[in-house]
């Protein structure tokens, strides 16, 4: 971790003052994937680019939030500023970031991660979301995501609210919450494993 | 239509201080920097400073520094330029330009500054 | 500080004619990680404001006849108007923003 958010810094910190607030001004209206808000613009307009790379990692998280800026520099025509963003990032992203468990063998064949199969079933049963949420904040959540999940009432529907950030997550997003529920209530994964 | 009218010429005494405005329309200065240029009589042009009206900070240069002040006010789309402490040598033509993020594609059409006692 | 030279200082031509001036900058101008050259050349006509021709060194303004084309990388530029009119003749500055602002001392072209 790290790598992106420094790639990102490298990138803005090369763009002069008038091109960066261009890109801040087309990151207000670029296409933002489901179940993530916008950085407001009064707090966008006046942030340096350490600031804004901060900004973006904390709201979007590393992976996305480099890919949002190398959309955004594209847009600008900066092509090959927005390539060497993306080679920077996906360096070595091969490898499950710290202290994830490789995937069993059956999850890694094509088709449905084990979160999805049993999303109605984690909807259901999961009664720890907090702890889930702590386990997620800062790696796969962002700030506003988890501010988001707890305000729900119940645990059903606090599940549902974060399974509505999914359609956005990569394999590895999803094993986080796996592993994070191995921890937390493993009884109930390995029930679902068996069914 | 993109516009930045600038105020009226100016006849001001040695060591007094003189305002300049420049007043945008047809955009929002805070989607932009603002750039000012000098231009003496028969002379080239010389880059004064920038401001970002966003958030008010600014660059000049350094001959500039401490002479020059750029100043917002958001809610008129209007940036002011005021010059201080003002000799012969700063009688001159002032020029405020839109930066748009590629260049200074729009100009003002100029304040003109004599400074006589 | 980035010093800009332009050369000539003058240049008399007659309608027609092609007409190249140059401008050399003190140090690069190009940043290699957005492979821009930033320098700009404007027109400025008598008594009125500057216009901006070309940007990033090679970049056509729109709107700006195609008889007017920006060449060079890192420190050595030039402005080229292919087949001079009457209109053309004013003073033309070059400027780089690669790192704050700074205008060359402008090459005036005049009719023979």
């Known amino acids: 971790m790290g790598r992106a958010r420094d790639a990102i810094l490298d990138a803005l910190e090369n763009l002069t003052a008038e091109e960066l607030k261009k890109f801040k001004l087309k990151l207000l209206s670029v296409p933002l994937r489901e179940g993530y808000g916008r950085i407001p613009r009064g707090a966008l307009l006046s942030m340096d680019a350490l600031d804004l790379t901060d900004k973006l990692v904390s709201f979007y998280l590393e992976t996305y939030g480099a890919e949002l800026t190398a959309n955004v520099l594209r847009d600008m025509g900066l092509q090959e500023m927005a390539g060497q963003l993306q080679a920077a990032t996906h360096q070595g992203s091969g490898a499950a970031p710290a202290g994830i468990q490789a995937p069993p063998q059956s999850a890694a064949k094509p088709g449905l991660h084990f979160i999805d199969q049993h999303r109605a079933a984690l909807i259901a049963r999961v009664t720890n979301v907090e702890w889930l949420l702590d386990a997620l904040y800062g790696k796969v959540l962002t700030d506003e995501q988890y501010q988001a999940v707890r305000a729900e009432p119940t645990n059903p529907s606090k599940m549902r609210k974060l399974f509505s950030f999914t359609p956005a997550w990569n394999w590895t997003c999803k094993d986080l919450l796996l592993q994070a529920l191995r921890e937390s209530q493993s009884y109930l994964v390995e029930d679902l494993e068996r069914s | 239509e993109v516009q930045l009218q600038q105020s009226g010429a100016d006849l001001v005494k040695p060591g007094a201080s003189v305002k300049l405005s420049c007043t945008a329309s047809?955009?929002?200065?805070?989607?932009?920097?603002i750039h000012w240029v000098k231009q003496r009589p028969a002379r080239g042009l010389e880059w004064v400073g920038r401001?970002?009206?966003?958030?008010?900070?600014?660059d000049y240069d350094p001959k500039f520094q401490g002479k020059a002040t750029m100043i917002t006010d958001t809610s008129s789309n209007t940036v002011y330029l005021q010059v201080s402490s003002l000799t012969s040598e700063d009688t001159a033509v002032y020029f405020c330009?839109?930066?748009?993020?590629?260049?200074?594609?729009?100009w003002g059409q100029g304040t003109s500054v004599t400074v006589s006692s | 500080d980035i010093v800009m030279s332009q050369s000539p200082s003058s240049l008399a031509v007659s309608a027609g004619e092609k007409v190249t001036m140059s401008c050399q900058s003190s140090?690069?101008?190009?940043?290699?990680?957005?492979?821009?050259?930033?320098l700009a050349w404007y027109q400025q006509k008598p008594g009125q404001s500057p216009k901006l021709l070309i940007y990033?060194?090679?970049t056509r303004k729109s709107g700006v006849p195609d008889r007017f084309t920006g060449s060079g990388s890192g420190t050595d530029f030039t402005l080229t108007i292919t087949s001079v009119q009457a209109e053309d003749l004013a003073v033309y500055y070059c400027?780089?923003?690669?790192?704050?602002?700074?205008f060359g001392a402008g090459t005036k072209l005049e009719l023979k």
């Open positions: 330009g839109r930066h748009d993020g590629y260049d200074m594609d729009y």
């Open positions: 401001i970002d009206p966003a958030n008010g900070n600014t």
């Open positions: 140090q690069s101008l190009l940043n290699g990680r957005t492979r821009r050259n930033y």
């Open positions: 047809g955009f929002n200065i805070e989607d932009t920097y």
């Open positions: 990033w060194a090679s």
């Open positions: 400027k780089q923003s690669y790192n704050l602002v700074t």
